[in-house]
Protein backbone atom coordinates (compact mmCIF):
# COMPACT_ATOMS: atom_id res chain seq x y z
CA UNK A 1 0.00 0.00 0.00
CA UNK A 2 1.02 3.73 -0.11
CA UNK A 3 0.12 7.19 -1.94
CA UNK A 4 0.79 8.46 -5.32
CA UNK A 5 1.30 12.01 -4.82
CA UNK A 6 0.59 15.25 -7.30
CA UNK A 7 2.18 18.53 -7.51
CA UNK A 8 0.81 20.75 -9.79
CA UNK A 9 3.01 23.70 -10.18
CA UNK A 10 1.78 26.40 -13.14
CA UNK A 11 -0.85 26.13 -15.57
CA UNK A 12 -0.77 28.45 -18.87
CA UNK A 13 -0.38 29.24 -21.58
CA UNK A 14 2.56 27.71 -23.65
CA UNK A 15 5.67 28.47 -25.49
CA UNK A 16 4.96 29.82 -28.92
CA UNK A 17 2.74 32.05 -31.22
CA UNK A 18 -0.84 31.66 -30.92
CA UNK A 19 -1.38 32.27 -27.31
CA UNK A 20 -4.72 30.75 -26.04
CA UNK A 21 -7.72 33.34 -24.61
CA UNK A 22 -7.77 33.44 -21.09
CA UNK A 23 -10.80 30.87 -19.46
CA UNK A 24 -12.26 33.37 -17.34
CA UNK A 25 -12.98 37.00 -18.00
CA UNK A 26 -14.85 39.82 -15.83
CA UNK A 27 -18.03 39.13 -16.40
CA UNK A 28 -17.63 35.31 -16.06
CA UNK A 29 -15.12 34.86 -13.33
CA UNK A 30 -13.93 31.71 -12.72
CA UNK A 31 -11.36 29.29 -10.92
CA UNK A 32 -9.65 25.70 -11.55
CA UNK A 33 -8.97 22.66 -10.40
CA UNK A 34 -7.83 19.56 -11.31
CA UNK A 35 -8.45 15.81 -11.59
CA UNK A 36 -6.29 12.95 -12.34
CA UNK A 37 -6.51 9.20 -12.74
CA UNK A 38 -4.10 7.01 -12.89
CA UNK A 39 -4.22 3.17 -14.56
CA UNK A 40 -1.45 0.52 -14.12
CA UNK A 41 0.91 -0.84 -16.92
CA UNK A 42 0.47 0.00 -20.28
CA UNK A 43 -3.30 0.82 -20.34
CA UNK A 44 -5.10 2.52 -22.54
CA UNK A 45 -5.42 6.17 -21.60
CA UNK A 46 -9.45 6.51 -22.46
CA UNK A 47 -10.82 8.75 -20.28
CA UNK A 48 -14.03 6.63 -19.78
CA UNK A 49 -11.78 3.73 -18.86
CA UNK A 50 -12.09 2.72 -15.04
CA UNK A 51 -9.02 4.29 -13.01
CA UNK A 52 -8.05 1.21 -12.06
CA UNK A 53 -5.16 2.84 -9.79
CA UNK A 54 -7.38 5.05 -8.08
CA UNK A 55 -7.97 9.04 -8.86
CA UNK A 56 -8.42 12.50 -7.17
CA UNK A 57 -9.96 15.54 -7.37
CA UNK A 58 -7.93 18.94 -6.10
CA UNK A 59 -9.97 21.47 -4.23
CA UNK A 60 -10.56 24.85 -5.89
CA UNK A 61 -8.28 27.09 -6.69
CA UNK A 62 -8.59 31.45 -6.59
CA UNK A 63 -11.00 33.33 -8.07
CA UNK A 64 -9.83 34.35 -11.33
CA UNK A 65 -10.45 37.45 -13.52
CA UNK A 66 -9.30 38.36 -16.68
CA UNK A 67 -7.34 42.03 -16.21
CA UNK A 68 -8.47 42.96 -20.13
CA UNK A 69 -6.14 43.41 -22.77
CA UNK A 70 -3.57 41.42 -21.07
CA UNK A 71 -2.31 38.21 -22.50
CA UNK A 72 -3.43 35.08 -20.42
CA UNK A 73 -0.52 34.68 -17.44
CA UNK A 74 -0.11 31.29 -15.55
CA UNK A 75 -3.58 30.74 -13.71
CA UNK A 76 -3.83 30.76 -10.07
CA UNK A 77 -3.58 27.22 -8.94
CA UNK A 78 -5.45 25.16 -5.81
CA UNK A 79 -3.41 24.88 -3.02
CA UNK A 80 -1.82 21.31 -1.95
CA UNK A 81 -1.42 17.96 -3.27
CA UNK A 82 -3.85 15.32 -5.35
CA UNK A 83 -3.26 12.37 -3.41
CA UNK A 84 -4.27 8.70 -4.68
CA UNK A 85 -3.98 5.93 -2.40
CA UNK A 86 -3.12 2.59 -3.42
CA UNK A 87 -4.04 -0.80 -1.47
CA UNK A 88 -1.94 -2.86 -3.39
CA UNK A 89 1.60 -2.90 -5.15
CA UNK A 90 2.98 -0.20 -7.06
CA UNK A 91 3.16 -1.52 -10.53
CA UNK A 92 6.13 0.81 -11.60
CA UNK A 93 4.66 1.34 -14.90
CA UNK A 94 1.56 3.44 -14.92
CA UNK A 95 -0.85 5.37 -17.22
CA UNK A 96 -1.97 8.90 -16.43
CA UNK A 97 -4.76 11.21 -17.11
CA UNK A 98 -4.54 14.60 -16.04
CA UNK A 99 -7.24 17.29 -16.32
CA UNK A 100 -7.71 21.35 -15.81
CA UNK A 101 -11.60 22.23 -15.34
CA UNK A 102 -12.88 25.28 -15.08
CA UNK A 103 -15.58 26.19 -12.62
CA UNK A 104 -17.58 29.26 -14.20
CA UNK A 105 -18.83 31.77 -11.23
CA UNK A 106 -20.99 33.98 -13.21
CA UNK A 107 -24.65 34.09 -12.96
CA UNK A 108 -25.78 30.67 -13.88
CA UNK A 109 -28.45 29.34 -13.04
CA UNK A 110 -28.51 26.16 -11.04
CA UNK A 111 -25.19 27.21 -9.49
CA UNK A 112 -21.89 27.20 -11.31
CA UNK A 113 -21.12 25.54 -14.58
CA UNK A 114 -18.00 23.16 -15.17
CA UNK A 115 -16.08 22.59 -18.35
CA UNK A 116 -12.95 20.70 -19.06
CA UNK A 117 -10.09 23.10 -20.32
CA UNK A 118 -7.09 20.58 -21.05
CA UNK A 119 -6.90 17.38 -20.74
CA UNK A 120 -2.96 15.57 -20.77
CA UNK A 121 -1.92 12.13 -20.91
CA UNK A 122 0.96 9.84 -20.32
CA UNK A 123 2.53 6.67 -19.49
CA UNK A 124 5.35 6.41 -17.59
CA UNK A 125 7.83 4.41 -15.48
CA UNK A 126 8.20 4.89 -11.36
CA UNK A 127 10.14 3.27 -8.96
CA UNK A 128 7.81 4.26 -5.10
CA UNK A 129 10.41 5.68 -2.80
CA UNK A 130 12.20 7.62 -5.02
CA UNK A 131 12.51 11.36 -5.88
CA UNK A 132 9.85 13.69 -6.98
CA UNK A 133 10.11 13.36 -11.20
CA UNK A 134 9.38 16.54 -12.99
CA UNK A 135 7.20 16.82 -15.97
CA UNK A 136 5.83 19.18 -18.56
CA UNK A 137 2.72 18.30 -20.58
CA UNK A 138 0.81 20.53 -23.63
CA UNK A 139 -2.43 20.23 -24.38
CA UNK A 140 -3.12 22.79 -27.95
CA UNK A 141 -2.12 25.87 -26.42
CA UNK A 142 -2.15 25.24 -22.84
CA UNK A 143 1.18 23.86 -21.06
CA UNK A 144 0.88 21.94 -17.43
CA UNK A 145 3.87 21.55 -15.20
CA UNK A 146 3.60 19.11 -12.23
CA UNK A 147 5.60 16.98 -10.34
CA UNK A 148 4.70 13.59 -8.72
CA UNK A 149 5.81 10.65 -6.90
CA UNK A 150 4.87 7.21 -5.33
CA UNK A 151 5.99 6.60 -1.41
CA UNK A 152 5.13 3.40 0.36
CA UNK A 153 2.70 3.47 3.72
CA UNK A 154 4.96 1.55 6.34
CA UNK A 155 5.20 -1.33 7.01
CA UNK A 156 5.67 -1.72 3.25
CA UNK A 157 8.85 -0.68 1.68
CA UNK A 158 10.75 -1.44 -1.41
CA UNK A 159 10.09 -0.03 -5.11
CA UNK A 160 6.77 -1.65 -5.15
CA UNK A 161 5.63 -1.58 -1.91
CA UNK A 162 5.66 -5.11 -1.45
CA UNK A 163 8.29 -5.90 1.40
CA UNK A 164 6.86 -5.96 4.67
CA UNK A 165 9.55 -4.17 7.38
CA UNK A 166 9.25 -5.76 10.91
CA UNK A 167 11.32 -5.53 13.75
CA UNK A 168 14.87 -7.78 13.94
CA UNK A 169 14.16 -10.89 16.20
CA UNK A 170 18.02 -11.22 16.52
CA UNK A 171 20.02 -8.10 17.13
CA UNK A 172 23.03 -8.83 14.40
CA UNK A 173 21.20 -9.79 11.17
CA UNK A 174 18.17 -11.11 9.31
CA UNK A 175 17.42 -14.88 8.75
CA UNK A 176 18.11 -16.70 5.40
CA UNK A 177 17.69 -15.02 2.33
CA UNK A 178 16.59 -11.52 4.27
CA UNK A 179 17.84 -8.54 4.10
CA UNK A 180 17.69 -5.47 6.46
CA UNK A 181 14.67 -2.79 5.47
CA UNK A 182 16.49 0.46 4.49
CA UNK A 183 16.31 2.92 5.70
CA UNK A 184 15.07 0.94 8.13
CA UNK A 185 18.44 -0.55 9.59
CA UNK A 186 16.70 -2.01 12.39
CA UNK A 187 14.02 -3.66 11.19
CA UNK A 188 13.89 -6.49 8.76
CA UNK A 189 12.50 -7.78 5.18
CA UNK A 190 10.11 -10.14 6.22
CA UNK A 191 9.84 -13.50 4.11
CA UNK A 192 6.00 -13.05 1.56
CA UNK A 193 4.18 -15.84 1.92
CA UNK A 194 1.75 -16.37 -1.46
CA UNK A 195 -1.34 -18.70 -1.36
CA UNK A 196 -0.79 -21.92 0.25
CA UNK A 197 -0.32 -24.37 -3.14
CA UNK A 198 0.73 -21.16 -4.83
CA UNK A 199 3.10 -22.94 -7.84
CA UNK A 200 6.29 -21.58 -7.45
CA UNK A 201 7.67 -21.73 -10.89
CA UNK A 202 4.24 -20.53 -12.87
CA UNK A 203 2.99 -18.79 -9.66
CA UNK A 204 4.03 -15.69 -7.38
CA UNK A 205 2.69 -12.90 -5.37
CA UNK A 206 2.75 -9.06 -4.64
CA UNK A 207 0.96 -9.26 -1.74
CA UNK A 208 0.63 -12.03 1.30
CA UNK A 209 -1.47 -14.70 0.17
CA UNK A 210 -2.62 -13.86 -3.56
CA UNK A 211 -0.91 -15.99 -6.15
CA UNK A 212 -0.91 -14.47 -9.56
CA UNK A 213 0.12 -16.41 -12.27
CA UNK A 214 3.41 -15.84 -15.12
CA UNK A 215 1.91 -15.86 -18.51
CA UNK A 216 1.02 -19.05 -19.77
CA UNK A 217 -0.08 -20.08 -17.05
CA UNK A 218 -4.12 -20.06 -15.04
CA UNK A 219 -5.92 -21.55 -12.10
CA UNK A 220 -5.88 -20.33 -8.67
CA UNK A 221 -2.87 -21.90 -8.00
CA UNK A 222 -1.39 -21.28 -11.61
CA UNK A 223 -1.01 -24.55 -12.08
CA UNK A 224 -3.24 -25.10 -14.77
CA UNK A 225 -1.29 -24.71 -18.29
CA UNK A 226 -3.07 -21.86 -20.70
CA UNK A 227 -3.54 -24.00 -24.05
CA UNK A 228 -4.55 -22.74 -27.40
CA UNK A 229 -4.90 -25.52 -29.50
CA UNK A 230 -8.70 -25.47 -28.77
CA UNK A 231 -9.75 -22.20 -29.05
CA UNK A 232 -10.26 -20.00 -31.65
CA UNK A 233 -7.41 -17.18 -31.38
CA UNK A 234 -4.99 -16.77 -29.36
CA UNK A 235 -6.24 -13.78 -27.70
CA UNK A 236 -8.09 -12.35 -25.57
CA UNK A 237 -9.04 -13.12 -21.36
CA UNK A 238 -7.96 -16.46 -19.79
CA UNK A 239 -10.50 -18.70 -18.45
CA UNK A 240 -9.91 -20.20 -15.23
CA UNK A 241 -11.77 -23.01 -16.18
CA UNK A 242 -10.94 -23.92 -19.23
CA UNK A 243 -7.11 -23.14 -19.35
CA UNK A 244 -8.45 -21.39 -22.51
CA UNK A 245 -7.41 -18.49 -24.23
CA UNK A 246 -11.13 -16.39 -25.77
CA UNK A 247 -10.86 -14.95 -28.67
CA UNK A 248 -11.43 -11.31 -28.37
CA UNK A 249 -10.99 -7.84 -29.91
CA UNK A 250 -7.03 -7.36 -30.48
CA UNK A 251 -5.63 -3.90 -29.23
CA UNK A 252 -4.29 -2.80 -32.25
CA UNK A 253 -7.44 -3.50 -34.56
CA UNK A 254 -8.65 -0.69 -36.13
CA UNK A 255 -5.08 0.97 -35.76
CA UNK A 256 -5.29 3.46 -32.85
CA UNK A 257 -1.74 4.84 -33.58
CA UNK A 258 -2.53 8.33 -35.79
CA UNK A 259 -0.25 10.19 -37.68
CA UNK A 260 1.75 6.98 -39.38
CA UNK A 261 2.45 5.43 -36.11
CA UNK A 262 2.89 1.56 -36.23
CA UNK A 263 1.15 -0.32 -33.71
CA UNK A 264 2.25 -3.54 -31.86
CA UNK A 265 0.46 -5.32 -29.10
CA UNK A 266 1.85 -5.92 -25.40
CA UNK A 267 0.57 -8.50 -22.85
CA UNK A 268 -2.11 -5.64 -21.28
CA UNK A 269 -2.85 -3.28 -23.96
CA UNK A 270 -0.85 -1.68 -27.40
CA UNK A 271 1.89 0.64 -28.02
CA UNK A 272 2.88 2.92 -30.94
CA UNK A 273 5.69 3.50 -32.39
CA UNK A 274 5.90 6.81 -33.89
CA UNK A 275 7.44 8.64 -36.60
CA UNK A 276 10.06 11.72 -36.15
CA UNK A 277 7.97 14.51 -34.92
CA UNK A 278 4.96 13.18 -33.04
CA UNK A 279 4.49 11.40 -29.68
CA UNK A 280 2.52 10.70 -26.95
CA UNK A 281 0.65 7.32 -26.70
CA UNK A 282 -1.22 7.40 -30.08
CA UNK A 283 1.54 9.66 -32.01
CA UNK A 284 -1.18 12.57 -30.99
CA UNK A 285 0.90 15.15 -30.14
CA UNK A 286 3.07 17.00 -33.10
CA UNK A 287 4.41 20.66 -34.44
CA UNK A 288 7.31 19.50 -31.76
CA UNK A 289 10.74 21.35 -31.39
CA UNK A 290 14.07 20.75 -29.76
CA UNK A 291 13.27 24.20 -27.77
CA UNK A 292 10.21 22.21 -26.31
CA UNK A 293 12.27 19.59 -24.88
CA UNK A 294 10.88 16.56 -26.42
CA UNK A 295 13.50 14.26 -25.29
CA UNK A 296 12.74 12.44 -22.01
CA UNK A 297 15.23 10.99 -19.73
CA UNK A 298 18.22 13.33 -20.78
CA UNK A 299 18.28 12.54 -24.06
CA UNK A 300 20.24 14.91 -26.65
CA UNK A 301 17.97 16.97 -29.33
CA UNK A 302 19.13 17.44 -32.79
CA UNK A 303 17.94 19.13 -34.95
CA UNK A 304 14.22 20.52 -34.85
CA UNK A 305 14.79 24.04 -34.97
CA UNK A 306 10.99 24.78 -36.26
CA UNK A 307 7.90 23.05 -35.93
CA UNK A 308 8.18 22.06 -39.76
CA UNK A 309 11.74 20.01 -39.64
CA UNK A 310 12.12 16.75 -37.63
CA UNK A 311 14.03 16.95 -34.40
CA UNK A 312 16.31 13.24 -32.68
CA UNK A 313 16.79 12.39 -29.42
CA UNK A 314 19.98 10.81 -29.16
CA UNK A 315 19.00 8.80 -26.04
CA UNK A 316 21.26 7.74 -23.02
CA UNK A 317 22.10 4.31 -22.45
CA UNK A 318 19.52 2.86 -20.87
CA UNK A 319 16.65 4.45 -22.56
CA UNK A 320 15.09 3.74 -26.02
CA UNK A 321 12.07 5.20 -28.22
CA UNK A 322 11.71 8.91 -30.51
CA UNK A 323 11.65 10.23 -27.42
CA UNK A 324 13.81 8.35 -24.91
CA UNK A 325 10.43 7.48 -23.21
CA UNK A 326 10.84 3.63 -22.94
CA UNK A 327 13.36 2.03 -20.66
CA UNK A 328 15.36 -0.38 -21.77
CA UNK A 329 14.43 -4.08 -20.81
CA UNK A 330 17.54 -5.27 -18.23
CA UNK A 331 15.90 -8.20 -17.51
CA UNK A 332 16.23 -9.76 -21.59
CA UNK A 333 19.98 -10.33 -20.27
CA UNK A 334 18.22 -13.12 -17.78
CA UNK A 335 19.95 -11.81 -14.70
CA UNK A 336 18.73 -14.14 -12.30
CA UNK A 337 20.01 -17.01 -11.15
CA UNK A 338 18.77 -20.80 -11.34
CA UNK A 339 15.28 -20.18 -12.90
CA UNK A 340 14.23 -16.69 -10.77
CA UNK A 341 11.64 -14.51 -12.52
CA UNK A 342 13.17 -10.96 -13.31
CA UNK A 343 11.64 -7.83 -12.52
CA UNK A 344 12.43 -5.12 -13.91
CA UNK A 345 10.93 -1.61 -11.42
CA UNK A 346 12.94 1.29 -13.26
CA UNK A 347 15.22 2.08 -10.80
CA UNK A 348 16.32 -1.73 -9.30
CA UNK A 349 16.27 -4.87 -10.86
CA UNK A 350 14.89 -7.43 -9.12
CA UNK A 351 14.31 -11.03 -9.20
CA UNK A 352 11.59 -13.73 -7.90
CA UNK A 353 13.19 -16.72 -7.13
CA UNK A 354 12.32 -20.74 -7.27
CA UNK A 355 11.80 -22.51 -4.03
CA UNK A 356 15.35 -23.30 -2.77
CA UNK A 357 16.69 -20.00 -3.55
CA UNK A 358 17.41 -16.76 -2.12
CA UNK A 359 19.49 -13.52 -2.00
CA UNK A 360 19.20 -11.03 -4.63
CA UNK A 361 19.92 -12.25 -7.75
CA UNK A 362 18.71 -15.79 -6.44
CA UNK A 363 22.48 -16.79 -5.99
CA UNK A 364 22.18 -18.64 -2.62
CA UNK A 365 20.67 -22.28 -2.74
CA UNK A 366 18.90 -22.46 0.42
CA UNK A 367 19.23 -26.29 0.77
CA UNK A 368 22.58 -26.67 0.10
CA UNK A 369 24.97 -28.46 2.84
CA UNK A 370 25.83 -25.43 4.98
CA UNK A 371 24.92 -26.55 8.08
CA UNK A 372 24.01 -29.84 7.52
CA UNK A 373 25.36 -32.74 8.82
CA UNK A 374 25.60 -36.58 7.26
CA UNK A 375 25.76 -39.04 10.20
CA UNK A 376 27.90 -41.75 11.03
CA UNK A 377 30.92 -40.47 8.71
CA UNK A 378 28.90 -39.97 5.63
CA UNK A 379 29.32 -36.93 3.19
CA UNK A 380 27.55 -34.22 1.61
CA UNK A 381 26.76 -33.92 -1.87
CA UNK A 382 25.29 -30.69 -3.46
CA UNK A 383 22.95 -30.40 -6.86
CA UNK A 384 20.05 -28.79 -7.87
CA UNK A 385 18.34 -26.66 -4.70
CA UNK A 386 18.56 -30.34 -3.03
CA UNK A 387 21.58 -32.25 -0.76
CA UNK A 388 22.18 -36.09 -0.42
CA UNK A 389 24.27 -37.75 1.92
CA UNK A 390 26.49 -40.10 0.00
CA UNK A 391 26.33 -42.79 3.38
CA UNK A 392 29.11 -44.79 4.80
CA UNK A 393 29.04 -48.68 4.51
CA UNK A 394 26.50 -50.05 6.55
CA UNK A 395 24.00 -47.05 6.34
CA UNK A 396 22.00 -45.02 4.56
CA UNK A 397 18.98 -43.07 4.79
CA UNK A 398 18.35 -39.03 4.03
CA UNK A 399 21.00 -38.38 6.56
CA UNK A 400 22.51 -41.34 6.81
CA UNK A 401 21.38 -42.18 10.52
CA UNK A 402 19.51 -45.29 9.54
CA UNK A 403 21.54 -48.80 9.76
CA UNK A 404 21.05 -50.39 6.29
CA UNK A 405 20.69 -53.86 6.09
CA UNK A 406 23.91 -55.16 3.99
CA UNK A 407 22.66 -58.59 2.92
CA UNK A 408 19.22 -56.92 2.06
CA UNK A 409 20.72 -56.71 -1.86
CA UNK A 410 21.86 -60.22 -1.82
CA UNK A 411 25.50 -59.77 -2.48
CA UNK A 412 26.58 -63.35 -2.29
CA UNK A 413 26.84 -65.24 -5.66
CA UNK A 414 25.86 -68.59 -6.30
CA UNK A 415 23.72 -69.33 -3.56
CA UNK A 416 26.20 -67.97 -0.79
CA UNK A 417 24.46 -67.17 2.66
CA UNK A 418 25.08 -63.54 3.56
CA UNK A 419 25.58 -62.63 7.44
CA UNK A 420 25.24 -58.93 8.40
CA UNK A 421 28.76 -58.66 10.34
CA UNK A 422 30.04 -54.85 12.46
CA UNK A 423 32.16 -54.25 9.66
CA UNK A 424 30.52 -54.71 6.77
CA UNK A 425 29.11 -58.45 5.90
CA UNK A 426 29.94 -62.19 5.06
CA UNK A 427 29.33 -64.46 2.93
CA UNK A 428 29.26 -68.14 3.51
CA UNK A 429 29.93 -69.74 -0.06
CA UNK A 430 28.33 -73.31 -1.59
CA UNK A 431 30.43 -75.84 -2.03
CA UNK A 432 32.28 -75.12 -5.23
CA UNK A 433 32.79 -71.41 -4.70
CA UNK A 434 34.93 -69.21 -2.96
CA UNK A 435 35.75 -65.34 -2.85
CA UNK A 436 34.67 -62.29 -0.67
CA UNK A 437 31.00 -62.84 -2.42
CA UNK A 438 31.74 -66.38 -3.88
CA UNK A 439 31.94 -65.02 -7.16
CA UNK A 440 34.83 -67.38 -7.82
CA UNK A 441 34.65 -71.27 -8.44
CA UNK A 442 37.14 -73.73 -7.29
CA UNK A 443 38.01 -75.68 -10.51
CA UNK A 444 37.54 -79.56 -10.11
CA UNK A 445 41.47 -80.43 -9.85
CA UNK A 446 41.55 -78.29 -6.81
CA UNK A 447 42.83 -75.44 -8.15
CA UNK A 448 40.62 -72.09 -8.12
CA UNK A 449 40.80 -69.48 -10.60
CA UNK A 450 42.61 -67.23 -7.86
CA UNK A 451 45.41 -67.23 -6.51
CA UNK A 452 45.93 -69.99 -3.44
CA UNK A 453 43.54 -68.80 -0.67
CA UNK A 454 45.01 -67.67 2.37
CA UNK A 455 47.00 -69.92 5.17
CA UNK A 456 44.39 -71.38 7.05
CA UNK A 457 41.04 -70.79 4.87
CA UNK A 458 40.22 -73.64 2.93
CA UNK A 459 37.50 -73.16 0.08
CA UNK A 460 33.93 -72.87 1.17
CA UNK A 461 35.27 -71.89 4.44
CA UNK A 462 33.45 -68.11 5.34
CA UNK A 463 35.12 -65.23 3.48
CA UNK A 464 34.70 -61.97 5.83
CA UNK A 465 34.45 -59.10 2.96
CA UNK A 466 35.91 -55.61 4.39
CA UNK B 1 32.92 2.28 -8.69
CA UNK B 2 33.10 0.07 -11.79
CA UNK B 3 34.19 1.46 -15.64
CA UNK B 4 32.88 -0.49 -18.64
CA UNK B 5 35.35 0.41 -21.71
CA UNK B 6 34.11 -0.85 -25.06
CA UNK B 7 36.46 -0.32 -28.26
CA UNK B 8 36.16 -1.46 -31.53
CA UNK B 9 33.26 -0.55 -33.96
CA UNK B 10 33.87 1.42 -36.80
CA UNK B 11 32.46 1.54 -40.61
CA UNK B 12 32.39 -1.66 -42.85
CA UNK B 13 30.53 -3.11 -45.92
CA UNK B 14 28.09 -5.10 -45.82
CA UNK B 15 28.87 -8.99 -45.37
CA UNK B 16 32.26 -7.84 -43.75
CA UNK B 17 33.40 -8.36 -40.13
CA UNK B 18 33.47 -6.29 -37.13
CA UNK B 19 35.03 -6.77 -33.21
CA UNK B 20 33.49 -5.16 -30.40
CA UNK B 21 35.31 -5.31 -26.83
CA UNK B 22 34.24 -4.48 -23.92
CA UNK B 23 36.22 -4.13 -20.51
CA UNK B 24 35.23 -3.62 -16.73
CA UNK B 25 37.35 -2.30 -14.20
CA UNK B 26 36.86 -1.03 -10.68
CA UNK B 27 37.53 -2.95 -7.29
CA UNK B 28 35.93 -5.57 -5.49
CA UNK B 29 33.45 -6.17 -8.01
CA UNK B 30 32.46 -9.32 -9.71
CA UNK B 31 30.50 -9.77 -13.08
CA UNK B 32 26.64 -11.30 -12.75
CA UNK B 33 25.53 -10.79 -16.47
CA UNK B 34 26.87 -8.81 -19.20
CA UNK B 35 26.11 -8.42 -22.74
CA UNK B 36 25.44 -5.86 -25.97
CA UNK B 37 22.35 -3.93 -26.74
CA UNK B 38 21.69 -1.77 -29.43
CA UNK B 39 18.43 0.40 -30.11
CA UNK B 40 17.01 -0.60 -26.61
CA UNK B 41 17.21 -4.49 -27.51
CA UNK B 42 19.73 -7.12 -26.09
CA UNK B 43 21.86 -8.33 -29.03
CA UNK B 44 24.03 -10.85 -27.07
CA UNK B 45 25.07 -11.78 -24.30
CA UNK B 46 26.32 -13.98 -20.88
CA UNK B 47 23.21 -14.06 -18.33
CA UNK B 48 23.32 -14.05 -14.95
CA UNK B 49 23.97 -18.66 -14.82
CA UNK B 50 26.66 -18.00 -17.68
CA UNK B 51 24.85 -19.21 -20.51
CA UNK B 52 25.15 -17.05 -23.66
CA UNK B 53 22.28 -15.75 -25.24
CA UNK B 54 21.29 -14.40 -28.87
CA UNK B 55 19.08 -11.97 -30.54
CA UNK B 56 17.11 -14.11 -33.40
CA UNK B 57 18.48 -11.75 -35.78
CA UNK B 58 21.95 -12.95 -35.33
CA UNK B 59 21.59 -15.79 -34.43
CA UNK B 60 24.40 -17.65 -36.70
CA UNK B 61 25.95 -14.53 -37.64
CA UNK B 62 27.43 -13.12 -34.18
CA UNK B 63 29.40 -14.63 -31.74
CA UNK B 64 30.18 -13.76 -27.77
CA UNK B 65 33.12 -14.92 -25.70
CA UNK B 66 34.35 -14.08 -22.50
CA UNK B 67 37.75 -13.32 -21.77
CA UNK B 68 39.69 -15.33 -18.76
CA UNK B 69 39.17 -12.68 -16.30
CA UNK B 70 35.70 -13.05 -17.09
CA UNK B 71 35.14 -9.44 -16.58
CA UNK B 72 35.54 -8.87 -20.51
CA UNK B 73 33.24 -9.60 -23.33
CA UNK B 74 33.56 -9.15 -27.14
CA UNK B 75 30.81 -9.99 -29.69
CA UNK B 76 32.45 -11.17 -33.01
CA UNK B 77 30.28 -9.92 -35.71
CA UNK B 78 30.29 -11.48 -39.27
CA UNK B 79 28.23 -11.46 -42.32
CA UNK B 80 27.29 -7.59 -41.24
CA UNK B 81 23.90 -6.17 -42.51
CA UNK B 82 22.99 -2.80 -42.87
CA UNK B 83 20.61 -2.99 -40.74
CA UNK B 84 23.20 -3.62 -37.61
CA UNK B 85 24.27 0.21 -37.98
CA UNK B 86 23.50 1.40 -34.75
CA UNK B 87 25.21 2.64 -31.30
CA UNK B 88 25.94 -0.84 -29.58
CA UNK B 89 25.93 -0.46 -25.86
CA UNK B 90 28.18 -2.59 -23.32
CA UNK B 91 25.95 -3.85 -19.78
CA UNK B 92 26.85 -5.24 -16.89
CA UNK B 93 24.90 -6.71 -13.81
CA UNK B 94 27.41 -5.98 -11.16
CA UNK B 95 27.83 -6.93 -7.67
CA UNK B 96 29.56 -4.61 -5.24
CA UNK B 97 29.80 -5.77 -2.10
CA UNK B 98 26.85 -7.46 -1.11
CA UNK B 99 23.92 -5.09 -3.52
CA UNK B 100 23.93 -5.26 -7.26
CA UNK B 101 24.29 -2.34 -9.80
CA UNK B 102 23.46 -1.77 -13.61
CA UNK B 103 25.97 -0.33 -15.48
CA UNK B 104 26.44 0.94 -19.31
CA UNK B 105 29.48 1.37 -21.75
CA UNK B 106 29.56 4.67 -23.06
CA UNK B 107 28.69 3.57 -26.41
CA UNK B 108 30.14 2.37 -30.38
CA UNK B 109 29.21 3.49 -33.81
CA UNK B 110 28.63 0.55 -35.95
CA UNK B 111 28.05 1.37 -39.50
CA UNK B 112 27.12 -1.07 -42.32
CA UNK B 113 27.06 -0.05 -45.75
CA UNK B 114 25.24 -1.53 -48.46
Known amino acids: AGVFELQIHSFGPGPGPGAPRSPCSARLPCRLFFRVCLKPGLSEEAAESPCALGAALSARGPVYTEQPGAPAPDLPLPDGLLQVPFRDAWPGTFSFIIETWREELGDQIGGPAWSLLARVAGRRRLAAGGPWARDIQRAGAWELRFSYRARCEPPAVGTACTRLCRPRSAPSRCGPGLRPCAPLEDECEAPLVCRAGCSPEHGFCEQPGECRCLEGWTGPLCTVPVSTSSCLSPRGPSSATTGCLVPGPGPCDGNPCANGGSCSETPRSFECTCPRGFYGLRCEVSGVTCADGPCFNGGLCVGGADPDSAYICHCPPGFQGSNCEKRVDRCSLQPCRNGGLCLDLGHALRCRCRAGFAGPRCEHDLDDCAGRACANGGTCVEGGGAHRCSCALGFGGRDCRERADPCAARPCAHGGRCYAHFSGLVCACAPGYMGARCEFPVHPDGASALPAAPPGLRPGDPQRYL | QVQLQQSGGGLVQAGGSLRLSCAASGSDFSINAMGWYRQGELVAGFTGDG??IYADSVKGRFTISRGNAENTVSLQMNSLKPEDTAVYYC?????????????WGQGTQVTVKP
Open chain 2, 91 to 103: AADVKIGGDYEWY
Open chain 2, 51 to 52: NP
